[in-house]
Interface confidence: low
């Protein structure tokens, strides 16, 4: 049938951060090419990444249409140079991915401290509201827009001269904390979705310390 050198894809894996979503699989093709299809549980299959020799396919454009849906993808294997050829059952070989629900499973990207401002013994720390690839009315929504109150940020802060760190949380993108006058503090933030069972937390942001350029100081 001309498919003897065609093997089914395996290790299909979703890689998704802030809704940027890529399906990866193995093996690297030798005598074959791949096409990916994606659908919701109740929807039609849509083909992407036609006859590619890549072992990944960016499915972001599809999943951002409704990040609360559950998606299934499948990877078809075709003989290189003979993509009309099918397997022994009359269809090309394919393998299904695990199910993927972006809203519940996309990884939270590493947040960034946008700025901090000290006024007397208080410091206001602002977390950058990162833009996602989810769109509404032709504009890209921020992480806060998409997750609403499901998303919180945890602030870790400590005196420059000390190892003991304190924590604070916010349901917005700003923290207002009390500090000791004359002391320099360092800050790191983490995005958290407490209601999740998996991928609840992002990695910590880069550490920012007072006395560096992101800070403003007022008496």
């Amino acid at each position: 049938s001309g498919t003897t050198n065609t093997v089914a894809a395996y290790n299909l894996t979703w890689k998704s951060t802030n809704f940027k979503t890529i399906l990866e699989w193995e093996p690297k093709p030798v005598n074959q090419v791949y096409t990916v299809q994606i659908s919701t549980k109740s929807g039609d299959w849509k083909s992407k990444c036609f006859y590619t020799t890549d072992t990944e396919c960016d499915l972001t454009d599809e999943i951002v249409k409704d990040v609360k849906q559950t998606y299934l993808a499948r990877v078809f294997s075709y003989p290189a140079g003979n993509v009309e050829s099918t397997g022994s059952a009359g269809e090309p070989l394919y393998e299904n991915s695990p199910e993927f629900t972006p809203y519940l499973e996309t990884n939270l990207g590493q947040p960034t401290i946008q700025s901090f401002e000290q006024v007397g013994t208080k410091v206001n720390v602002t977390v950058e509201d990162e833009r996602t690839l989810v769109r509404r009315n032709n504009t890209f929504l921020s992480l806060r827009d998409v997750f609403g109150k499901d998303l919180i940020y945890t602030l870790y802060y400590w005196k420059d001269s000390s190892t003991g760190r304190k924590t604070n949380t916010t349901h917005t993108n700003e923290f207002l904390i009390d500090v000791d006058k004359g002391e320099n503090y360092c800050f790191s933030v983490q995005a958290v979705i407490p209601s999740r069972t998996v991928n609840r937390k992002s990695t910590d942001s880069p550490v920012e310390c007072m006395g560096q350029e992101k800070g403003e100081f007022r008496e």
Partner: antibody
Framework: QVQLQESGPGLVKPSQTLSLTCTVS?????????WSWIRQHPGKGLEWIGE???????RYNPSLKSRVTISVDTSKNQFSLKLSSVTAADTAVYYC??????????????????WGKGTTVTVSS | EIVLTQSPGTLSLSPGERATLSCRAS???????LAWYQQKPGQAPRLLIY???SRATGIPDRFSGSGSGTDFTLTISRLEPEDFAVYYC?????????FGGGTKVEIK
């Protein structure tokens, strides 16, 4: 449809604790909404006191935070407000409301779509 | 705290006229979090508009909302007798959630 009903004493003495309960009928308190308390001083505007999610997580108005506790009892489909150390300035109509996250086209909208009728609380000795 | 300033404080109009109510925020508010309410004496507020421009269920189409960032507007295209009331804007995006001071629409 969902209805809310506030209940509690209409008269509270200064320095005591004001306690109100909001009973949710026609729907489950655990259905994914937030539940708020708002008050309105006589002849004045509206002031948000705080809110609770059915899981128990709360947010409070910082101006009242040191005196406010909001709790939820999912088994009774109720949530409650306690405001300690009351003064005459706490005399108001107290409303409970449902703060609905409405998911549409990739993101959330929030609004208070269901309100109780309100209960008048007077702080006086 | 986000301060919402409503203007005018009072609007005196006749039935059939157009009412334009303004709500200005002290800092930018995502339209997802901006709502308008109507309140009549002795009653609880009633949701009119959410998401700055979407009408709530059962609200007549003479009510419309617009705006973004710091400037929002509620428009009543033709006032009906039942529309004379106090109108509040509200933001539910940043704690503490805040209401404007209200605009009273009264019969001229």
């Amino acid at each position: 449809q969902v209805q809310l009903q506030e209940s509690g004493p209409g008269l509270v003495k200064p320095s005591q604790t004001l306690s109100l309960t909001c009973t949710v009928s026609g729907g489950s308190i655990s259905s994914g909404q937030y539940w708020s308390w708002i008050r309105q001083h006589p002849g004045k505007g509206l002031e948000w006191i705080g809110e609770i999610y059915y899981s128990g997580s709360t947010r409070y108005n910082p101006s009242l935070k040191s005196r406010v506790t909001i709790s939820v009892d999912t088994s009774k489909n109720q949530f409650s407000l306690k405001l300690s150390s009351v003064t005459a300035a706490d005399t108001a109509v107290y409303y409970c409301a449902r703060d609905t996250p409405y998911y549409y086209d990739g993101g959330y909208y929030y609004y208070m779509d269901v309100w109780g009728k309100g209960t008048t609380v007077t702080v006086s000795s | 705290e986000i301060v919402l300033t409503q203007s005018p404080g009072t609007l005196s109009l006749s039935p059939g006229e157009r009412a334009t109510l303004s709500c200005r925020a002290s800092q930018s508010v995502s339209s997802s979090y901006l709502a308008w309410y109507q309140q009549k004496p002795g009653q609880a507020p009633r949701l009119l508009i959410y998401g700055a421009s979407s009408r709530a269920t059962g609200i007549p189409d003479r009510f419309s909302g617009s705006g973004s960032g710091t400037d929002f507007t509620l428009t009543i295209s033709r006032l009906e007798p039942e529309d004379f009331a106090v109108y509040y804007c509200q933001q539910v995006g940043v704690v503490p959630y805040t209401f404007g001071g209200g605009t009273k629409v009264e019969i001229k």
